[in-house]
């Protein structure tokens, strides 16, 4: 099933201590899906969208950037026939970068 779209949403972090907000949206066929956010291949957070919503926003607390590195990806799952979970393709990666200190 098609990959979700992923986007870093404001307010953008300016340091590793700032929270990170990442929106993940499934295509229109799949409202109410279960979403998983990955970083560097490891699960960071899981969220379920309400039944009338197509996406979720992951809110990662400050310091999350110190976790295993690499880009973020998200994925969603839906129940298919025989109540078996079907997983989407992974989203495109999204990288979080911080302004270079000017001192």
């Amino acid at each position: 099933i098609p990959a979700p779209s992923i986007r870093l949403v404001p307010p953008y972090p300016s340091s590793q201590e700032d929270p990170i907000h990442i929106a993940c949206m499934a295509p229109g066929n799949f409202p109410g899906a279960n979403f998983t956010l990955y970083r560097g291949g490891q699960v960071v957070q899981l969220l379920q969208a309400p039944t009338d919503q197509r996406g979720v926003t992951f809110n990662l607390s400050g310091g999350s950037s110190k976790a295993p590195g690499g880009p973020f990806h998200c994925q969603y799952g839906v129940l298919g026939e025989l109540n078996q979970s079907q997983l989407s393709d992974l989203s495109e990666p999204v990288n979080v970068s911080f302004p270079v200190p000017t001192w």
Epitope: R7, A23, M25, F30
Partner: antibody, heavy 116, light 107 residues
Amino acid sequence: QMQLVQSGAEVKKPGASVKVSCKASGYTFTTHAFSWVRQAPGLGLEWMGWISTYNGNTKYEQKFQGRVTLTTDSSTNTAYMELRSLRSDDTAVYYCVRDSRAFDVWGQGTMVTVSS
Amino acid sequence: DIQLTQSPSFLSASVGDRVTITCRASQGINSYLAWYQQKPGAAPKLLIYAASTLQSGVPSRFSGSGSGTEFTLTISSLQPEDFATYYCQQLNTYPLIFGQGTRLEIK
């Protein structure tokens, strides 16, 4: 090339029903939902409802609830919109749209005229 | 239900101008907003989805920004073919409401 081809224009009397078809080609039918949008002459876009080709679930704009039915037929890659109890203010162009991350493929529109 | 308000409703501009259209949502819709262009007698065309992602084949002079409740569509340098009506749409939650439209005309 992804394409949605709708059935032709209709003229109906008040109280009648209309069923508009929308045939999809150029992509896998069951991976994308459909929404239906209408546009009365000179006015804006009005979302009517949504149907999942994955499991058949539907959602309708409240003002159309009970008067509209959306269906799909995956054997012919076709979506349908039936609107009942037509009134003169239902006169509009009706669009089927592929509902993906947004409404990325639109049918050419079907003009439905309701007149006594 | 979520309401979307576009401003301005009507805009007069010249070829080469930079124009901005705003769409405000009555409650937060994350980044789940799309922009469409419609020319007379034609079906709408998707320009931008997820607030800022350019749909394939759309010229780069179109850009979108915003999150939460306030969004903008910017055309950096108007071309003759850009004179049309523009609609925003929220895709966060059902019903999938459209804004009332902004008509962009040649000055």
